[in-house]
Amino acid sequence: ARNGDDCPLGPGRCCRLHTVRASLEDLGWADWVLSPREVQVTMCIGACPSQFRAANMHAQIKTSLHRLKPDTVPAPCCVPASYNPMVLIQKTDTGVSLQTYDDLLAKDCHCI
Amino acid sequence: ARNGDDCPLGPGRCCRLHTVRASLEDLGWADWVLSPREVQVTMCIGACPSQFRAANMHAQIKTSLHRLKPDTVPAPCCVPASYNPMVLIQKTDTGVSLQTYDDLLAKDCHCI
């Protein structure tokens, strides 16, 4: 798999980690989360050209079949390879509690 | 998450397992694989509307932010949740060998 800077479509256009600022309202969390009021959401965005950051054999197959049958088989998709945990201060019936989520923020990305 | 048959876009249009028949030539494997000569490739194809088969909290966030910023944040993508192993008879310098691949065929799908 090529590294993140070796994008044949031009710098920054291929699958990589992006940060999107979002409020609790944006996320639909305002009714159950107290803090943070704003989250720097890290997510995987970008194109997956041939063999770029291919996650596994399945991704390689998908690339080959997409080239042959682009209307039937989609190109591989840029998704999280791993996650960073995040703590939320959640509203409860009686007050607040701390809860850590392991699958909330993307840590790095690959194509699958 | 809604089940696979509860697609708001119409039956079979949301993220689910599809089978695509592919030859060794289609896959670009003809020079290193002897058998099978044809593979029933199972892969994940289909749309990921709001909360459909959401893999985790990250997928839910992505749905919310895609709704708000469709030009910046893509919708969740239909990808394998797990795989079925597959054995290939591979050509070697001296003959053939059996090799099992764990990440070749999608077993079930989710949106992320």
């Epitope: 803090s35 943070p36 720097q40 960073n84 945990p85 703590v87 201060i89 701390l98 923020l105 | -």
Partner: antibody, heavy 118, light 107 residues
Framework: QVTLKESGPGILQPSQTLSLTCSFS??????????VGWIRQPSGKGLEWLAN???????YYNSALKSRLTISKDTSNNQVFLKISSVDTADTATYYC??????????WGQGTLVTVSS | DIVMTQSQKFMSTSVGDRVSVTCKAS??????VAWYQQKPGQSPKALIY???YRYSGVPDRFTGSGSGTDFTLTISNVQSEDLAEYFC?????????FGGGTKLEIK
Amino acid sequence: QVTLKESGPGILQPSQTLSLTCSFSGFSLSTYGMGVGWIRQPSGKGLEWLANIWWNDDKYYNSALKSRLTISKDTSNNQVFLKISSVDTADTATYYCAQEVYGWFAYWGQGTLVTVSS
Amino acid sequence: DIVMTQSQKFMSTSVGDRVSVTCKASQNVGTNVAWYQQKPGQSPKALIYSASYRYSGVPDRFTGSGSGTDFTLTISNVQSEDLAEYFCQQYNSYPLTFGGGTKLEIK
């Protein structure tokens, strides 16, 4: 279960550098939103916030003490360190480390007593 | 720096009574105020977050209220185990600051 434990020299002389260690378990400083703060309390007095360090290595210091304070972390070993240079008798206190979540000290260590005496 | 003032250093109450501990911020801190309880010989313990939200496990006789500059911690039906010092803290901006503390004495 979150636990924090402070360790320090117990006693040191004026002008020396105080080195404190906070060893914690039950959470990770690689978690977004998580921090560790240091607070001190002279005997019979109130609480004074000293410094904190966040998951992303952001650091904040008490403005009155900033020139003397250095906070750092070892994320993989679940430890946070605080150094206070040029101590004097006014730095005699119980020093606490606490798990900080979005500005709030959710869990505190038992504290370590530090005496500065010649 | 934001100064948090707890004007009453000591408060005396009886078991079963209701008592209110007050805290005043030198400038608007919204609801970014926490309350802590420190029993004799122990480390502080979190009670209230965001001015009015009880932390999990804190008895419901502890109630926080207020916003802006004036904040109150109310203990209804005071128990003997509530003998402690209570501190407010603002986290609206750095440096983080604590009130001077209010010691609750049980008659």
